[in-house]
Interface confidence: medium
Amino acid sequence: VKMAETCPIFYDVFFAVANGNELLLDLSLTKVNATEPERTAMKKIQDCYVENGLISRVLDGLVMTTISSSKDCMGEAVQNTVEDLKLNTLGR
Amino acid sequence: VKMAETCPIFYDVFFAVANGNELLLDLSLTKVNATEPERTAMKKIQDCYVENGLISRVLDGLVMTTISSSKDCMGEAVQNTVEDLKLNTLGR
Amino acid sequence: EICPAVKRDVDLFLTGTPDEYVEQVAQYKALPVVLENARILKNCVDAKMTEEDKENALSVLDKIYTSPLC
Amino acid sequence: EICPAVKRDVDLFLTGTPDEYVEQVAQYKALPVVLENARILKNCVDAKMTEEDKENALSVLDKIYTSPLC
């Protein structure tokens, strides 16, 4: 069974951006070899979270976790398996 | 296909605790009919997050999101589906 | 692999209209304060970022999605 | 239904030793700063909560897991 893989580096970057943590953002972006213009762009997004205070960070973190743990995402893992099993069955 | 259901009320409570949001915690705990001693216990956990500042909230939020979106959790959804499909096949 | 629903959320945050983005958030969390906040953030990003900035942000996302750490 | 890995994380946070909890976190996020933070939180909770508090917290979790909202 092919397991669903869920991109931990994405959540590292998202949490760094949403929590206004510039050091954590730099660390995460280094891991994906981001260029200077790319870092600048991500920092502009981060600025919006910082300017709008804690309300933005908490609520948007809640939204992201809600989406990530929703049936849409969990169901995606299930769907991949069903496709694999279909192929395996047809291939016999 | 039975979709994986992932307990949104758990994440509401977790984020309320980890973000030190007492009001959001109260709201979430009311939804599960928590008693006063139960609320007090959850608020003690919340105090630890508050005392340790924003970094605790960010990092622990990151851990929870990583676990929730890990292969272990996504794989659980997949496993449930495989079991269902096995039963369906055997039942034919 | 990133979940498509998460990818859609981020794509709309960068390339969608405020209405499209907020509508998508509403499917997951419909509290007034969440929806109004989502619009504040989306408008901020649209005001702060040039087209080039958005292309660079999308390029970062592409690097994230194709990274061995994803 | 809650994912067992999440359930295990929360159970160890309440009932495990600091070493057991941190070891479990390390399986998912092995950054030193994350593990250090996990230990600080775990020690704080152990210091602050009585056995009765922990039983009450586990009872809340039970209510969460059996709730129609879960």
Partner: antibody
Framework: QVQLQQPGTELVRPGASVKLSCKAS????????INWVKQRPGQGLEWIGN????????NYNQKFKDKATLTVDKSSSTAYMQLSSPTSDDSAVYYC??????????????WGQGTTLTVSS | NIVMTQSPKSMSMSVGERVTLSCKAS??????VFWYQQKPDQSPKLLIY???NRYTGVPDRFTGSRSATDFTLTISNVQAEDLADYHC?????????FGAGTKLELK
């Protein structure tokens, strides 16, 4: 300091539409939601709707959907509410109020003085 | 729409007494409840938000509390300047709704 300025009174004939104004100062107008609230003499408060000045997006109470139209003029930091085909039921005090952005909760932190609208022939 | 029911409609008090105003929501509104004070010919002023948070500058004799869908505003040691209308409201879902108000009068 933050201020929301509204005219004290407006007189309008039945059926003739009227546009109430609310001039904001002392803060970044485009960053805060503006809400409108109705109060009839001796009665409670009724939420009409709100508008986000940055992109003019509106949320309406269904009850006022066909009655009120909310707009803003960013250049003058002014919010407007137009009431169509007014009747005596629309005679009331109308307040504009700003939604606070601090914390995770929703509240109105600043209010205008209110405009008393009289619909009379 | 969520209905917020305030009681009593009015009450007469003497200076120094303790007052309890009630507000009941027709369904779950979490802690998304606020209280406003409105004096004659003035606009409302925020007292409490999020059910129990006292707004900046509000005297600590004003306290908000919540039990499920029942919300209470308590004024301990009522002063003459507290005589006013008190409105509760909810922001849990659109449309935002308010109670009909409670008038606090002097005996």
């Amino acid at each position: 300091q933050v201020q929301l300025q509204q005219p004290g009174t407006e007189l309008v004939r039945p059926g003739a539409s009227v546009k109430l104004s609310c001039k904001a100062s002392g803060y970044t107008f485009t960053s805060y939601w503006i809400n409108w609230v109705k109060q009839r003499p001796g009665q409670g408060l009724e939420w009409i709707g709100n508008i986000y000045p940055s992109d003019s997006y509106t949320n309406y109470n269904q009850k006022f959907k066909d009655k009120a139209t909310l707009t803003v003029d960013k250049s003058s930091s002014t919010a407007y509410m137009q009431l169509s085909s007014p009747t005596s039921d629309d005679s009331a005090v109308y307040y504009c109020t700003r939604r606070g952005n601090y914390g995770n909760l929703y509240y109105f932190d600043y209010w205008g003085q209110g405009t008393t609208l009289t619909v009379s022939s | 729409n969520i209905v917020m029911t305030q009681s009593p409609k009015s009450m007469s008090m003497s200076v120094g007494e303790r007052v309890t105003l009630s507000c009941k929501a027709s369904e779950n509104v979490g802690s998304y409840v606020f209280w406003y004070q409105q004096k004659p010919d003035q606009s409302p002023k925020l007292l409490i938000y999020g059910a129990s948070n006292r707004y900046t500058g509000v005297p600590d004799r004003f306290t908000g509390s919540r039990s499920a869908t029942d919300f209470t505003l308590t004024i301990s040691n009522v002063q003459a300047e507290d005589l006013a209308d008190y409105h509760c409201g909810q922001s849990y879902s659109y449309p935002l709704t308010f109670g009909a108000g409670t008038k606090l009068e002097l005996k």
